[in-house]
């Protein structure tokens, strides 16, 4: 079941999926001046069996000006611009991508890929949040949001990470030092 919405955004933070559940789709988007090849896939799909998950289909972009040149999927470091899923200020590795059964790793970039990746997540997907540069978490450690099915509708749990600037913290003198990170957003423990 696909999640109806994108993961929630929260002030002064970015999110990233560390691994993608089977069923996740990634749009084959090309950067300005390029388009998908005529017979090319619309999206990549995370599929797998009990032991191994991988991305089906390949995204291929060609120049909008030329009709017959096709470019193979080749990682090009200079093409790896900022994307929604790679905006973190520092590495976050709360899970080992490879060790999660039923999940795919981050797909490698393809030549002339668009600067922002558009994922279509499935129920059970988890994304992790981190404060942007210049802000710090009131609580240390990762905070996440999970796509859940409740009452027949999908929804993302509200992340519990609070990111605060130095000036904001100074309004609250003499208070306890933050220790741990609350996670997720409450959802009923009983499903409908």
């Amino acid at each position: 079941e696909l999640c109806d919405d994108d993961p929630p955004e929260i002030p002064h933070a970015t999110f990233k999926a560390m691994a993608y559940k089977e069923g996740t789709m990634l749009n084959c988007e090309c950067k300005r001046g390029f388009r998908r090849i005529k017979s090319g896939s619309l999206y990549m799909l995370c599929t797998g069996n009990s032991s191994h998950s991988s991305w089906d289909n390949q995204c291929q972009c060609t120049s909008s000006a030329t009709r017959n040149t096709t470019k193979q999927v080749t990682p090009q470091p200079e093409e790896q611009k900022e994307r929604k899923t790679t905006e973190m200020q520092s590495p976050m590795q709360p899970v080992d991508q490879a060790s999660l059964p039923g999940h795919c790793r981050e797909p490698p970039p393809w030549e002339n890929e668009a600067t922002e990746r558009i994922y279509h997540f499935v129920v059970g997907q988890m994304v992790y949040y981190q404060c942007v540069q210049g802000y710090r978490a009131l609580h240390r450690g990762p905070a996440e949001s999970v796509c859940k099915m409740t009452h027949g509708k999908t929804r993302w749990t509200q992340p519990q990470l609070i990111c605060t600037g130095e000036m904001e913290t100074s309004q609250f003198p003499g208070e306890e030092k933050p220790q741990a990170s609350p996670e997720g957003r409450p959802e009923s423990e009983t499903s409908c």
């Epitope: 955004e9 509200q158 309004q171 208070e175």
Partner: antibody, heavy 116, light 107 residues
Amino acid sequence: QVQLVQSGAEVKKPGESLKISCKGSGYSFTNYWIVWVRQMPGKGLEWMGIISPGDSTTRYSPSFQGQVTFSADKSISTAYLQWSSLKASDTAMYYCAIGPYYLEYWGQGTLVTVSS
Amino acid sequence: DIVMTQSPSTLSASVGDRVTITCRASQSISSWLAWYQQKPGKAPKLLIYKASSLESGVPSRFSGSGSGTEFTLTISSLQPDDFATYYCQQYNSYSLTFGGGTKVEIK
């Protein structure tokens, strides 16, 4: 389902102490920020502050700093709001809610009346 | 603190009317704004978050718009159940602040 149940209405005299409660159920209580909100009679909503029941990290609104204390007992999934010396101006409805941003789940409120 | 100013403070309307409530922030809050409905003796109920996202189970006649410092809550066709007080709330800072409220009453 997710529920926050608050303790019953209180009538107190100025100078008395008071502790009201907010019990969470249907979710993992220690993992979520609890927000306290005051509503004085016929007035709007005011954010008092937040507490993380997992480790009792607190943040108070400057208006309420030193006037109230937040605490939590995770063994019974309950957050508390307390006063050591009540004033007539503390007369209000007090709500707990699950935060920290938009407040999706609320307690039913506890009416505190302080009168001599 | 970020100051939230709501207008009007009272609004008289009839069933079927299109109703618009405005909320202004004293500084830019991006889209970090929520709207609540409160009925007498009850806790507030979340209607909209992130300025325009409709909370699950809230009727589609409610909509929110705006960003930066100017926001609106619109009820496209007022229903008898909609007579209540409405509050905006910013969460650009975790030190939350609410607007003063708009009471929607029967004309």
